[in-house]
């Protein structure tokens, strides 16, 4: 087993919004859980974007989910991750 | 580390309003988390009634909503529950809690106070 | 809202027996699953977050299971300290729900 390394990303969207993207890559095998919450509970699903689950050239995998917030609710927001039995949460950097 | 300290009166009288305080010390209340109030019944169930967040935002359990205020006093660090047209249904032990945003379970708990709701 | 079932609702057993308490979930609650213990007289404490995870301090002779709808608590070896009430806690969605709770009593 391989954990995957888990990047929290923000970018400009639309006025007063910002899009954050949690990446997760270099994991093996490649079933893996990667989510945002909001408030502590789960956030919608048609809310969220997901990436395929991609091989990234090292025998390893790769994906992302990403969201749009408005800014200054950012604290609000966490990426959850889960990859054979080990969990781990991840804010939105300031 | 964080602590939580319940207040208020222990009798209500059927129709009138509960209200009860939750000072928190070792954190500041605007700094972060979901400050929550729940409840628990005479025959032990538990209920989540609500949180105020560390901006002032609220979410309340739907069973309640038209009966439940939850504030704050930034400068004491305290929050507070209102609660109003009681009934003896309400007879409970009220505790406040937080929650971090990576997920919403109740990590620390006051050490509660029991309100009756009676003539 | 997700209603959360417990069972047993009681439990009478010796310190050294291993016990299990399950939860049922009326969604799937996707590992979105708290345990806490309490004592007569105290406030709950948490025991288990993310429905696996030991909260600090817990002993190890806690483990938690399940996914989806079904999901256990496990308690080897009993020691005299573990008894009171055991509740599940969903937070996969608002309104957050408790299960009615399981005592653990000494036989």
């Known amino acids: 087993t391989v954990p995957p390394m888990v990047n929290v990303t923000r970018s400009e969207a639309s006025e007063g919004n910002i899009t954050v993207t949690c990446r997760a890559s270099s994991f093996y095998p490649r079933n893996i859980a990667l989510t945002w919450r909001q408030d502590g509970v789960s956030l919608s699903h048609d809310t969220q974007q997901w990436g395929d689950v991609l091989p990234d050239g090292n025998g390893t995998y790769q994906t992302w989910v990403a969201t749009r917030i408005c800014r200054g609710e950012e604290q609000r927001f966490t990426c959850y991750m889960e990859h054979s039995g080990n969990h781990s949460t991840h804010p939105v950097p300031s | 580390d964080v602590q939580l300290q319940e207040s208020g009166p222990g009798l209500v009288k059927p129709s009138q309003s509960l209200s009860l305080t939750c000072t928190v010390t070792?954190?500041?209340?605007?700094?972060?988390?979901?400050w929550n109030w729940i409840r628990q019944f005479p025959r032990n169930k538990l209920e989540w009634m609500g949180y105020?967040?560390?901006?002032?935002?609220?979410n309340y359990n739907p069973s309640l909503k038209s009966r439940i205020s939850i504030t704050r006093d930034t400068s004491k660090n305290q929050f507070f529950l209102q609660l109003i047209s009681v009934t003896t249904e309400d007879t409970a032990t009220y505790y406040c809690s937080y929650y971090r945003y990576d997920g919403a379970w109740f990590p620390y708990w006051g050490q509660g106070t029991l309100v009756t709701v009676s003539a | 809202d997700i209603q959360m079932t417990q069972s047993p609702a009681s439990l009478s057993a010796s310190v050294g027996e291993t016990v299990t308490i399950t939860c049922r979930a009326s969604?799937?609650?996707?590992?979105?699953l708290a345990w806490y213990q309490q004592k007569q007289g105290k406030s709950p404490q948490l025991l288990v977050y993310n429905a696996i995870m030991l909260a600090d301090g817990v002993p190890s002779r806690f483990s938690a299971s399940g996914s989806g709808t079904q999901y256990s608590l496990k308690i080897n070896s009993l020691q005299p300290e573990d008894f009171g009430s055991y509740y599940c806690?969903?937070?996969?969605?608002?309104?957050?729900?408790f299960g009615a709770g399981t005592k653990v009593e000494i036989k």
């Open positions: 070792g954190y500041s209340i605007t700094s972060d988390y979901a």
């Open positions: 806690q969903h937070f996969w969605s608002f309104p957050l729900t």
């Open positions: 105020i967040n560390y901006s002032g935002t609220t």
């Open positions: 969604g799937n609650i996707h590992n979105y």
